[in-house]
């Protein structure tokens, strides 16, 4: 039930009245407005932009609204010397060379300031020699490679394909293996949906589309110079050859066209199986190096693109809680896109710009928020998520002690079959109720809530009647108030089918092709995806901000750490006998979940029945709420990722886009058999046992009555 | 130490199927391929198909036109080989070797398809 | 699909001396032949892969050549327990194809 009664206003301003504000129409303008231009980091028009946005939510009755600036690592192509890659003969002639741009959209073909395809932060080389496809470079990819089929990358060049895991983590990965280049390219299989056009016709990758990305190994960051603290005016600053998460190998991206004249060449050794092939039709041949006639040919890498500190501007909008103001709760997303960020990030842009609008309308009116709400318009974050980290680093200290929820707000689509949710758990029981009060915009559903659809589209894999809500993972914005700080967090989109689409996120992601036609024509005509995600984010931030009692449910942490216990330890009982003789134990997990079970379930006895009519019990109350995330927070960090600092939940090491629970133990426990030294791995997993049963117990006594 | 133990020897009628099962010990299940070859009685050896384990990827020699399925269950570390619609020229013994290189193989089964 | 052609058909060599196998592929495989060592009633085991890479625990007697299309399995001092039939076997290409091998026998 949505609760109004924190501020002594008139009864019609609830959260009806803000969601009733919402309008696709605006959603829609907002979107055209955002993307008829480039707006890349660092650049002068994201820096209008910035400014233009800060002028309107002033406009729509913000308290106020302040540009935040930094001056962070940014990369950029070199303008005249282009990157490319090409085979050469045996004497040394480009026999052939990849496209040095994207052909351009209709209707773009003037449009200046379009950055060419490449990997960010990619350093400078030109390395030439053999090819190796290595699939999707996960971690499995290279043990296949590596373990079974006895294929050596050192000093090679590694061709694979996009999806599955970040583009960082595949890169790392070829580092690992001793690679020399990577090129990555974007294979039908995973990037052209059977049945559908490519752009201009439909949502699908041409074959001279490509995408864009950063491929840097953060692990939370932010600036590559100045971990930890913030890029302002009298920062100190690591040399380059100190900075974090930077690639030591050439990287350039490349479409279909040119993979097919590359993988078509391929000799070796075949493909281990079916996983390996994608869609082209080519052999898909591992190598090492080209077949027969073309054995002699080489493939080599021309990049020049440099790394250069830029100034870069968040936009920080202040809405002032009327009760409870030094509480935040903060709805961010980015501004800067790779061209013209048709879906990343305007399509989440304009429905933060139409959820401030609301607000604001709401507040000309005489309402306030309880709380104080901030929203943010996040620079860089294609960069590494740069804007929102050196922002948060600035505001640690004031985050840490009044920072009740984050809420994200990139893309606000990646399909349109069903809502996406991924979040804590204090936040199930929010998402389930306010999507019980909207309505659902899917075609079939006339009538019903958000929540059926929801939930027979795609439901729980463990619950009857539920949907999935899956792990926070990283890759956006929320990193680093969930992952270092401890905010609850959550994310919400609409997105494809997964069971009919095995594609990696959408085919024109970071492509020159992700233009307002993309979703005006293809993905929302009528705006009411858009529309569904903008109540689904500004209901989130409503309730947070104006709730009595913080809609956070502890029990339903209970439950996930149960889940995740009983995981961690069928991954250890897959080694019986190490686990016998080293004397590994999960009990003191077990009696820790178990601990926080009681202890969670008599708290919210307790919330159920407490005066809260009296401030000093509210406030006591909502502050254990507010601050039981902040418990899973471990202040030296995971091992080799201090950034990363929640215990229950961290980016995955082998893909930085999926979460993992319990990653302590589960990266201790990863590949372990392989290990030379078994006594000092295993050591390691009874101490990330210790550390995760502390945590959880820990996290349960501030639940705990206070005396 | 690496060891395939392969299922006991099958006497099969025309038209039938047969399902061999290989358990494997001694390494990491999912990291190594599984392949499944056939040798007829004092013949060479013949591929018919391989599996990933992690992932279930499979690949099949065409020769057996959808006659054969390759399978794995990860709980127990062990593939199976099932040939249907069995004939008489079907007759061999069937081997599972782990890893792409073939690095380790089990001891066979003898498959004798008889009216 | 690739054929792998074995020559000779069999071998007779005093113990001591050399054996040089020989392993054609219809089409260009690259390094990719494997070579197999199978005793009367036992199952084939690995011997050379990647055309010239010895196997775990495989002496050193025996040793892989060529890429291409032409290939070699040398064994340079036979000894009785290398009494056995020799396959050799392309990864290159789907079907994988091993050749009819070759019967190895002490003079």
């Known amino acids: 039930k949505s609760s109004n009664e924190a501020t002594n206003i008139t009864p019609k301003h609830n959260m009806k009245a803000f969601l009733d504000e919402l309008k696709a129409e605006n959603i829609k303008k907002f979107l055209y407005n955002f993307t008829q231009i480039p707006h890349l980091a660092g650049t002068e028009q994201n820096f209008q932009l910035a400014k233009q946005i800060q002028s309107q939510w002033k406009e729509f009755g913000l308290d106020s609204v302040e540009l935040a600036h930094y001056d962070v690592l940014l990369s950029y192509p070199n303008k005249t010397h282009p990157n490319y890659i090409s085979i050469i003969n045996e004497d040394g002639n480009e026999i052939f060379n990849t496209s040095l741009f994207e052909p351009p959209p209709p209707g773009y073909e003037n449009v200046s300031d379009i950055v060419p395809p490449f990997s960010a932060f990619s350093p400078q080389g030109m390395p030439e020699g053999d090819l190796v496809y290595v699939n999707y470079a996960r971690t499995e990819d290279f043990f296949k490679l590596e373990r079974d089929m006895k294929i050596n990358c050192s000093g090679k060049i590694v061709i694979a394909r996009y999806g599955k895991v970040f583009r960082g983590n595949k890169v790392k990965n070829a580092q690992l293996a001793g690679a020399k280049g990577v090129i990555l390219y974007s294979d039908p299989a995973d990037y052209f949906a059977p049945g559908v056009k490519s752009y201009p016709d439909g949502w699908n990758l041409p074959g001279g589309g490509v995408q864009r990305g950063n491929i840097l190994n953060l692990n939370g960051a932010g600036d590559p110079l100045t971990p930890g603290y913030p890029a302002n005016e009298y920062a100190y600053r690591r040399g380059i050859a100190e900075a974090v998460g930077l690639p030591s190998i050439p990287v350039h991206p490349i479409g279909y066209y040119d993979a097919q004249k590359l993988l078509e060449k391929m000799g070796g050794s075949a493909p281990p199986d079916s996983s390996w092939r994608g869609s082209l039709k080519v052999p898909y041949n591992v190598g090492p190096g080209f077949t027969g006639n073309f054995s002699t040919q080489k493939v080599k890498m021309h990049i020049h693109s440099t790394n250069e500190v830029t100034r870069i501007y968040n936009v920080i909008g202040t809405l002032r809680g009327a009760v409870e103001p030094d509480r935040y709760v903060i709805l961010g997303g980015h501004r800067d896109s790779w061209v013209f960020g048709g879906i990343d990030p305007q399509s989440g842009a304009a429905v933060v710009h139409e959820i401030v609008r609301s607000f604001g309308t709401l507040k000309k009116e005489g309402w306030r928020p309880r709380r104080t709400i901030l929203f943010a318009s996040w620079d860089a974050e294609e960069f590494g998520l740069l804007g929102s980290t050196e922002w948060a680093e600035e505001n640690s200290r004031l985050l840490q002690e009044r920072g009740v929820a984050y809420i994200n707000a990139d893309s606000s689509i990646e399909g349109n079959y069903t809502l996406r949710v991924d979040c804590t758990p204090l936040m199930y029981s929010l998402v389930h109720n306010l999507t019980k009060e909207l309505k659902s915009p899917d075609e079939g559903f006339e009538g019903k809530s958000l929540y059926e659809s929801w939930t027979k589209k795609s439901p729980s894999p463990e619950f009857s009647g539920m949907p999935r809500i899956s792990k926070l993972g990283s890759g956006n914005d929320f990193e680093v108030f969930f992952q270092r700080l401890g905010i609850a967090s959550g994310r919400a989109r609409y997105t494809k089918n997964w069971e009919t689409n095995k594609f990696s996120g959408y085919p024109l992601y970071h492509s020159v092709y992700e233009t307002y036609e993309l979703v005006e024509k293809f993905y929302d005509p009528m705006f009411k995806y858009h529309l569904t995600v903008a109540q689904v984010r500004g209901g989130m931030v409503f309730e947070l901000a104006n709730s009595i009692v913080l809609p956070f449910d502890c029990r339903d942490y209970a439950v996930v750490l149960r889940k995740y216990a009983d995981k961690i330890y069928s991954i250890s009982m897959k080694h019986p006998q190490e686990m016998k003789t080293y004397s590994v134990s999960f009990d003191s997990l077990f009696s820790a979940v178990k601990n926080f079970t009681e202890i969670a379930s008599k708290f919210s006895e307790r919330l159920q029945d407490f005066d809260k009519s009296n401030p000093i019990v509210l406030r006591m109350m909502n502050d254990q709420l507010m601050f039981l995330e902040r418990a899973f927070i471990d202040p030296l960090g995971l091992p080799d990722r201090p950034f990363y600092r929640h215990v229950i939940y961290a980016p995955s090491s082998h893909n930085k886009y999926a979460g993992e629970s319990f990653p302590g133990i589960y990266d201790a426990l990863f590949d372990i058999e392989s290990k030379v030294d078994p006594s000092k791995a295993w050591g390691e997993v009874k101490r990330q046992i210790y550390v995760a049963a502390f945590t959880v117990q820990a996290a349960a006594e501030t639940l705990s009555e206070v005396a | 130490e690496v060891q395939l133990v392969q299922s006991g020897a099958e006497v099969k009628k025309p038209g039938a199927s047969v399902k061999v099962s290989c358990k494997t010990s001694g390494y990491t299940f999912t990291e190594y391929t599984i392949h499944w070859v056939r040798q007829a009685p004092g013949q060479s050896l013949e591929w018919m198909g391989n599996?990933?384990?992690?992932?279930?990827?499979?690949t099949y020699n065409q020769k057996f036109q959808g006659r054969v399925t390759i399978t794995v269950d990860k709980s127990t570390s062990t593939a199976y080989m099932e040939l249907s619609s069995l004939r008489s020229e079907d007759t061999a013994v069937y081997y599972c070797?782990?890893?792409?290189?073939?690095?380790?193989w089990g001891q066979g089964t003898l498959v004798t398809v008889s009216s | 699909d690739i054929v792998m052609t074995q020559s000779p058909d069999s071998l007779a060599v005093s113990l001591g001396e050399r054996a040089t196998l020989s392993c054609r592929a219809s089409q260009d495989v690259g390094t990719a032949v494997d070579w197999y060592q199978q005793k009367p009633d036992q199952s084939p085991k690995l011997l050379i892969y990647w055309a010239s890479t010895r196997h775990t625990g495989v002496p050193d007697r025996f040793t892989g050549s060529g890429s291409g299309t032409d290939f070699t399995l040398t064994i340079s001092s036979l000894q009785a327990e290398d009494v056995a039939v020799y396959f050799c076997q392309q990864k290159n290409s789907y079907p994988l194809t091993f050749g009819a091998g070759t019967k190895v026998e002490i003079k």
């Open positions: 599996i990933n384990p992690n992932n279930g990827g499979t």
């Open positions: 070797a782990a890893g792409w290189n073939f690095d380790y």
